[in-house]
């Protein structure tokens, strides 16, 4: 006698909405074998029984999950084979937030996988990737699981969200991160990926240490306007290590804007520079405390600002304005930064 089940696996994963046939057959030397499936819920597939075989058709509904057993008997001998059926849902429906990342900010990125089943943290895992590697230094916040609102009854699909706090993305910033979601099922591993682009920035020639936080530059015609774009402007650590700071400017379409450079070697001096052709002048219009207490040198397309007496730069926003046009660039400098410190 021979007893066969096809497919022969003891665990089978079936994508929701797809059908699968499991054929159980037995040959018998003395007459015809009796083959049947048992342990079936009334809803678990449909069975077609033929002489010496029985075919279980699974329709790929969540209710098809179960462990049917095929029993074959021939005379006094009997065999059985159980098949654990797992119906899963893992469509390529990843949603990431924000739509793009801004370098130099302490920010949270979230990745949501929609219409998932099973909603089991042991079978579904999230990773934040830089290239093909997990992003070092990202901090995983608590995962969230919520039931999706379904049009049809009896389909309890879920959405699962993982959030991370990002480390500094370094300079130059990578072009993108990726959220990768993996579903691990019996004999089957499925993966989806979604790109999270990184807004590219222009940096001055001295790049900072790639693991360190940096001041963040925002360019806009008005500070309020820039903040209202939804960028979460934050300060940076007021504890070492500190990089040799080089500010970042959001690359943007539109008018030419001034650029702010920092020189730690010169005892904390800021330089605002316009490079938009002749006839353009720049001046400092905002600094923490009273602008009059700073030492200023203005020479057409260049304007310097330094602390008097020489010492650490004060924490807060610095603003440089360009005329004609009135475009401004704002720089946030973290507190307690002292010259010539490095990581």
């Amino acid at each position: 006698q021979s007893f066969q089940v096809n497919p022969p696996e003891s665990e089978v994963a079936v994508a929701m909405g797809t059908s699968l046939q499991i054929t159980c057959s037995m040959s018998c030397d003395e007459g015809v074998a009796r083959v049947h499936w048992r342990g079936l819920d009334t809803s678990l597939g449909s069975v077609q029984t033929l002489p010496g075989s029985s075919i279980l058709s699974v329709r790929g509904m969540l209710s098809d999950t179960g462990t049917p057993v095929c029993v074959g008997s021939c005379g006094s001998r009997s065999f059985q084979h159980s098949v654990k059926i797992l119906v899963y849902a893992f469509p390529d429906q990843l949603v990431v937030s924000p739509e793009f990342l801004v370098p130099g900010q302490d920010q949270v990125v979230s990745c949501t996988a929609h219409n998932i089943w099973p909603a089991d943290p042991n079978s579904l895992s999230f990773a934040l990737l830089l290239g093909e590697q997990r992003l070092e230094g990202a901090q995983a916040l608590e995962p969230e699981q919520e039931e999706e609102i379904q049009e049809a009854e009896g389909t309890p699909l879920f959405r699962m969200t993982q959030r991370w706090r990002l480390p500094s993305l370094g300079t130059p910033a990578p072009p993108a991160l990726h959220c990768q979601v993996t579903m691990q099922l019996p004999k089957l591993v499925l993966t989806h990926r979604k790109e999270i682009p990184v807004l590219q920035s222009q940096t001055s020639p001295k790049p900072p240490n790639t693991t360190s936080a940096e001041p963040y530059i925002l360019t806009s015609s008005s500070t309020a306007e820039a903040v209202s774009t939804g960028l979460n402007i934050t300060t940076l650590p007021s504890a070492p290590p500190y990089p040799k700071l080089s500010p970042r400017t959001l690359s943007s379409e539109g008018p030419c804007r001034p650029k702010i450079h920092q020189d730690l070697e010169a005892g904390w001096e800021l330089l605002c520079e316009a490079s938009c052709g002749p006839g353009v002048t720049v001046r400092w219009t905002l600094a923490p405390g009273d602008l009059a207490t700073y030492h200023k040198r203005e020479a057409g397309a260049q304007a310097w600002l330094s602390v008097l007496p020489p010492g650490p730069m004060v924490e807060g926003w610095f603003q440089c304005r360009q005329d004609p046009g009135g475009e401004v660039t704002n720089l946030y400098v973290p507190g307690q930064v002292t010259p010539n410190s490095s990581s």
């Epitope: 230094g137 995983a140 480390p167 500094s168 300060t235 507190g335």
Partner: antibody
Amino acid sequence: EVQLLESGGGLVQPGGSLRLSCAASGFTFSSYWMHWVRQAPGKGLEWVSYISGSGGYTNYADSVKGRFTISRDNSKNTLYLQMNSLRAEDTAVYYCARDRPYYYDMDVWGKGTTVTVSS
Amino acid sequence: DIQMTQSPSSLSASVGDRVTITCRASQSISSSLAWYQQKPGKAPKLLIYAASSLQSGVPSRFSGSGSGTDFTLTISSLQPEDFATYYCQQYKSYPVTFGQGTKVEIK
């Protein structure tokens, strides 16, 4: 100087409520995530809750979920922990701590305030 | 949750001794580990972050090493002010968790 100062602790009966405050100074409070961490008498440190700089993200240890609420008032540079349905096992010194961006350690701690839950 | 296990739970040492405390994570936490010092009646103080970086103002006799699941805090030459309890903490994922502490006592 960067400082955190907790207040609001005291003796409360089981089932009662308390509101702890943490006054921050010397740094841009709204830019930092903040934590509450507690330490029961003679025991180790236990993380209780965090809140993000804007207050948009919060989370709690399982042991306090549904009973404690973390909040902040950035205009007052103050962090809060509302503690309801207090139990004897909530007896501890409660510390507020600052979370450092990018590194996510707790680089500044307050001196702590003592909460005693007893009948 | 990630469990952090410190050893030993207590140790006796003399001034000038080299002291080593270990911390093991139940799963890989990369370098997302901090060490804190706590003296009786005082708040914890950050000593080491990112597994091996010395916090500003902390004496250089303190050092940290390790990555993944196994970490070490070393005090190269114990000073009288170092007698305290030391805690490791992982911040790779929430809930952040602390080791149970290692009490360093005077021999």
